[in-house]
């Protein structure tokens, strides 16, 4: 058993039929010594009395509010929440697995510049009764600081007959040198209780790996005279790193018919413009990505060719 | 009506072990939470333990790992296994179906003496 927060403790349970649980003593907060009864959420059944209580907790009916009172004065409360470990791994139920990149993907970040700043996801089914608190770091034996913000509710999707829910966190590392090298892995640890049940989900990350620019904006097309031929230029986004001559991109410039089965044609540059044929119809779309190291493209910055 | 008749007590020295049982009757006994309270010589009742409807137990402090309530609802049986016991666990022990031991049976003397 440990403490979550002031009053909040978190007992962890292995979690298989007929398992035995865990004795927790739990002890009233007051000066007093005599005549202190225990009862267990809003049931008025006493469970028991003494300053010092020894409970059994083995499932989620023996989880919950724990209040010792006397004389009808409630003195303190005890919240007992549930970490439950099966077949040796702690459960996963309250956030979907994201499977991208890789199974078992449950928090996804991203940054869009080397400041330091980032976001990092997390999708659920669950919609009510849901608390979520977000710490960070970067190392884990002498850890920096990365002050996150509080997780909220970001979006809302129907999938099937599902509805799903992301929430989403701001993190900014607290002293940031965007042109270091980096050598230790940015933590993030987040715990999430739902009702009685709580679980913690970590990830580790250089910040050169989560990477994903904005897209490229003021996307704008030239005709050339007397040609099929266009010239499209664009600029760096915004809240990508400065300066660029240090920070660079590269960019992908496609032209897409209107069916998808249309061939596409595409051209890399590390300038901030290009010459492409604008067919009838089609869409000219760019994108950007780190010049030297190859994190993930931004979306698609587009402009119909009419 | 609600019937409860302890047994098991005796006299054990100090160190010894005994198992109480209680036969209960007249009520779900299954869906109710239970308990055992004892009363030493001179002194008020004093809770002991308590077991809930799912078998999780709950003890007073002074029991520190020496006792262990259980029951067994196919036979409408309250247990009480009391291991390492000492002077000062001479008393008469009740099993009850309430905290204040208001329903309860007319209990089983233990007294532990050398």
């Known amino acids: 058993i440990w403490e979550l927060k002031k009053d909040v403790y978190v007992v962890e349970l292995d979690w298989y039929p007929d398992a035995p649980g865990e004795m927790v003593v739990l002890t009233c907060d007051t000066p007093e010594e005599d005549g202190i009864t225990w009862t267990l959420d809003q049931s008025s059944e006493v469970l028991g009395s003494g300053k010092t209580l020894t409970i059994q907790v083995k499932e989620f009916g023996d989880a919950g509010q724990y209040t010792c009172h006397k004389g009808g004065e409630v003195l303190s409360h005890s919240l007992l929440l549930l970490h439950k470990k099966e077949d040796g791994i702690w459960s996963t139920d309250i956030l979907k697995d994201q499977k991208e990149p890789k199974n078992k993907t449950f928090l996804r970040c991203e940054a869009k510049n080397y400041s330091g700043r980032f976001t990092c996801w997390w999708l659920t089914t669950i919609s009510t009764d849901l608390t979520f608190s977000v710490k960070s770091s970067r190392g884990s034996s002498d850890p920096q600081g990365v002050t996150c913000g509080a997780a909220t509710l970001s979006a809302e999707r129907v999938r099937g007959d599902n509805k799903e829910y992301e929430y989403s966190v701001e993190c900014q590392e607290d002293s940031a040198c965007p042109a270091a090298e980096e050598s230790l892995p940015i933590e993030v640890m987040v715990d999430a209780v739902h009702k009685l049940k709580y679980e913690n989900y970590t990830s580790s990350f250089f910040i050169r790996d989560i990477i994903k620019p904005d897209p490229p904006k003021n996307l704008q097309l030239k005709p050339l005279k007397n040609s099929r031929q266009v010239e499209v230029s664009w600029e760096y986004p915004d809240t990508w790193s400065t300066p660029h001559s240090y920070f660079s991109l590269t960019f992908c410039v496609q032209v897409q018919g209107k069916s998808k089965r249309e061939k596409k044609d595409r051209v890399f540059t590390d300038k901030t413009s290009a010459t492409v044929i604008c067919r009838k119809n089609a869409s000219i779309s760019v994108r950007a990505q780190d010049r030297y190291y190859s994190s993930s493209w931004s979306e698609w910055a587009s402009v119909p060719c009419s | 009506q609600v019937q409860l008749v302890e047994s098991g007590g005796g006299l054990v020295q100090p160190g010894g072990s005994l198992r109480l049982s209680c036969a209960a009757s007249?009520?779900?006994?299954?869906?109710?939470?239970m308990y055992w309270v004892r009363q030493a010589p001179g002194k008020g009742l004093e809770w002991v333990a308590t077991v809930k409807t799912n078998n999780s137990t709950v003890y007073a402090d002074f029991v520190k790992g020496r006792f262990t309530i259980s029951r067994d609802n196919a036979k409408n049986t309250l247990y009480l296994r009391m291991n390492s016991l000492k002077p000062e666990d001479t008393a008469l022990y009740y099993c009850?179906?309430?905290?204040?031991?208001?329903?309860r049976g007319q209990g089983t003397q233990v007294t532990v003496s050398s």
């Open positions: 009850a179906r309430d905290y204040a031991g208001r329903l």
């Open positions: 007249g009520f779900t006994f299954s869906s109710s939470w």
